[in-house]
């Protein structure tokens, strides 16, 4: 059993039919001695008397909100929350597997530019009684300062029968120098609770390799005299880290037929412009990437041939 | 993804084309080891990021676009010194710091040069004979050193009497491309940054 | 104590379906996930699938996906194996068992599939 | 496709030491803890040994299990005429938990 937060502790279970679970001794918060009465949750029941109190936990009937009274005033309470331990592996019941870029992805996390900042988001089904805490530091054994807010509700979908909820959260890295060369990870650790069920989920990376940057902005067309071909040129997005020159953007150019079975035509350039023949009612995109280092590419960027 | 390859302009400074050939044979390379060696830890998430450079150069700091020089995060280190006299500082009014970087960026490429030789003679002798450095990238460390031409010291290519351990040396290998390759993002983005100024 | 009594077993010509039971006992069954493993006669263990405490996620082996629904009825207490297009390959004493460091197995129950 | 490689058969007299084998990679044994198994004739396996080296209650400690790295054994010390039988390790990859990862088994015959 270990504390989570002031008057919430966690027990862990192995987790199995008939497993003999942990026995637990809450201690009433109080220099009281004697006619002290302890009760779980909203039931009136006494479960036992005295300045301590011993509980078989073997399953989630037996945690919750344990509480020691005298002459019918309440003294302090004792939140218990269970962690299962299934085979070895601890339950992951609270989060979906996003299985992207790999299965057993939980928590996602995305960075627009080297400055430290990135977000993160996970998928749940369950929309009540749910709770998640987030910290993050850079290393784990000599950890040095990431500051991460609180958990928002970003967005709600339907996925089939059910309704699917994403949750997300901000992090900035205290001292953080775009240029630095990472050789310690970012760790990231999410406190889940659902009702009486506690998880943890964990991520680590490097900046770098989360690095997606926003699409280029101020996308146009110019056409070219006498030709089927426009100059389309972009600016690299305000979001990315500057100089431009030191931390340099490549871009792929793509011109897409109104139907998606019509044939992409596609350019890399590193430059901030491109000719490209323009069909009609066709469009013209195009998505950023690092040049250097190959991470995420942006999302496309589009305006209309016509 | 193959890097678009830039043909240089005449007048370009002189590192950038040798960078960008750096960059892509490093990666190429760590590639090529982390599918040749599918059973050991060469992953990016497997690996001990270790850098041979560190406390020797300090081409993050040494080369830090001014925009950088602001940020209190990006000075923790910047006393390190270098000979200066390098041919791609060529017909360029370079400050003392842009010497330090180029100097500093070299003794990177000649510390990692020694390392990937020695490395190399070991994994010639492995009865195995499962991965060996490209002579590609060898020889575009040795390009891009020609190119920033400093005068330093030869350093010797380590020698070991005892029998190699083929798994350590492998994952060394891995260890060592990785942090080459985080090592030739930062040249190459130096060399851009110098490039456009 | 935990048991889990297994029935629905048999033959069953190839292409045919069937369903297989587990009657769960003597433990909160609506608590624990469940697996299903078979044995192909003088081969080795193969797992089959697994259904989460709740029902919410459910896992196949390549070799069944597409043709096994896993199910549960807990308030029934009952794990279930629904399976279709069957195939020779798919002759085998089919186990349930339970999901945990200590596990619980079914008695076993033979499908032969054959014409 | 099985994952987990065990020696097809091994034999020993009573009272001898007999080990099995179950050689895995990285991603199932080398992040996962191991079981072994204990199938006698007609029966429904039993658990000898779960969490690489745990041996539950009413398993004699005749039986023991350990890992290391991407491996792991059983050893039956002092071998009986009733511990013939196939043996099976089992493990997760991380892949693809909660799917049973199950060794090739090993048949163990007791000679004499």
């Known amino acids: 059993i270990w504390e989570l937060k002031k008057d919430v502790y966690v027990v862990e279970l192995d987790w199995y039919p008939d497993a003999p679970g942990e026995m637990v001794v809450l201690t009433c918060d109080t220099p009281e001695e004697d006619g002290i009465t302890w009760t779980l949750d909203q039931s009136s029941e006494v479960l036992g008397s005295g300045k301590t109190l011993t509980i078989q936990v073997k399953e989630f009937g037996d945690a919750g909100q344990y509480t020691c009274h005298k002459g019918g005033e309440v003294l302090s309470h004792s939140l218990l929350l269970l962690h299962k331990k299934e085979d070895g592996i601890w339950s992951t019941d609270i989060l979906k597997d996003q299985k992207e870029p790999k299965n057993k992805t939980f928590l996602r996390c995305e960075a627009k530019n080297y400055s430290g900042r990135f977000t993160c988001w996970w998928l749940t089904t369950i929309s009540t009684d749910l709770t998640f805490s987030v910290k993050s530091s850079r290393g784990s054994s000599d950890p040095q300062g990431v500051t991460c807010g609180a958990a928002t509700l970003s967005a709600e979908r339907v996925r089939g029968d059910n309704k699917e909820y994403e949750y997300s959260v901000e992090c900035q890295e205290d001292s953080a120098c775009p240029a630095a060369e990472e050789s310690l990870p970012i760790e990231v650790m999410v406190d889940a609770v659902h009702k009486l069920k506690y998880e943890n989920y964990t991520s680590s990376f490097f900046i770098r390799d989360i690095i997606k940057p926003d699409p280029p902005k101020n996308l146009q067309l110019k056409p070219l005299k006498n030709s089927r071909q426009v100059e389309v040129s972009w600016e690299y997005p305000d979001t990315w880290s500057t100089p431009h020159s030191y931390f340099s953007l490549t871009f792929c150019v793509q011109v897409q037929g109104k139907s998606k079975r019509e044939k992409k035509d596609r350019v890399f350039t590193d430059k901030t412009s491109a000719t490209v023949i323009c069909r009609k009612n066709a469009s013209i995109s195009v998505r950023a990437q690092d040049r250097y280092y190959s991470s995420s590419w942006s999302e496309w960027a589009s305006v209309p041939c016509s | 993804r193959n890097l678009p390859v830039a043909t240089p302009d005449p007048g370009m400074f002189p590192c950038l084309h040798h960078s960008q050939n750096l960059l892509r044979a490093v990666s190429n390379m760590l590639q090529k080891a982390r599918q040749t060696l599918e059973f050991y830890p060469c992953t990016s998430e497997e690996i001990d990021h270790e850098d041979i450079t560190k406390d020797k150069t300090s081409t993050v700091e040494a080369c830090l676009p001014l925009e950088l020089t602001k940020n209190e995060s990006c000075l923790n280190s910047r006393e390190t010194s270098f000979i200066t006299n390098g041919s791609c500082l060529a017909s360029r009014k370079t400050s003392f710091m842009m010497a330090l970087c180029l100097s500093s960026i070299y003794e990177d490429l000649k510390m990692y040069q020694v390392e990937f030789k020695t490395m190399n003679a070991k994994l010639l002798m492995d009865p195995k004979r499962q991965i060996f450095l490209d002579q590609n990238m060898l020889a575009v460390i040795d390009e891009l050193m020609q190119a920033l031409n400093f005068n330093s010291e030869t350093v010797p290519q380590k020698s070991s009497l005892e029998e190699p351990d083929f798994y350590k040396t492998k994952i060394k290998l891995c260890i060592l491309l990785h942090a080459f390759r985080i090592r030739a993002v930062t040249i190459d983005r130096v060399m851009s940054y110098l490039n456009a100024s | 104590q935990v048991q889990l009594v297994q029935s629905g077993g048999g033959v069953v010509q190839p292409g045919r379906s069937l369903r297989l039971s587990c009657a769960a006992s003597g433990f909160t069954f609506s608590s624990y996930g469940m697996h299903w493993v078979r044995q192909a006669p003088g081969k080795g263990l193969e797992w089959v699938a697994f259904i989460r405490y709740d029902g919410s996620n459910k896992y196949y082996a390549d070799s069944v996906k597409g043709r096994f629904t896993i199910s549960r009825d807990n308030s029934k207490n009952t794990l279930y194996l629904q399976m279709k297009s069957l195939r020779a390959e798919d002759t085998a004493v089919y186990y349930c068992?339970?999901?945990?460091?200590?596990?619980?197995w079914g008695q076993g129950t033979m499908v032969t599939v054959s014409s | 496709s099985y994952v987990l490689t065990q020696p097809p058969s091994v034999s020993g007299t009573p009272g001898q030491r007999v080990t099995i084998s179950c050689s895995g990679g990285?991603?199932?044994?080398?992040?996962?803890?191991v079981k072994w198994y204990q199938q006698l004739p007609g029966t429904a396996p039993k658990l000898l040994i779960y969490?690489?080296?745990i041996r539950p209650s009413g398993v004699p400690d005749r039986f023991s299990g350990s890992k290391s790295g991407t491996s792991a054994s059983l050893a039956i010390t002092g071998v009986q005429a009733e511990d013939e039988a196939d043996y099976y390790c089992q493990s997760y990859d991380r892949g693809t938990h909660p799917a049973l990862l199950f060794g090739t088994g090993t048949k163990v015959t007791v000679l004499g």
């Open positions: 990285r991603s199932n044994i080398g992040s996962n803890t």
């Open positions: 969490g690489n080296d």
């Open positions: 068992k339970t999901h945990g460091s200590h596990d619980n």
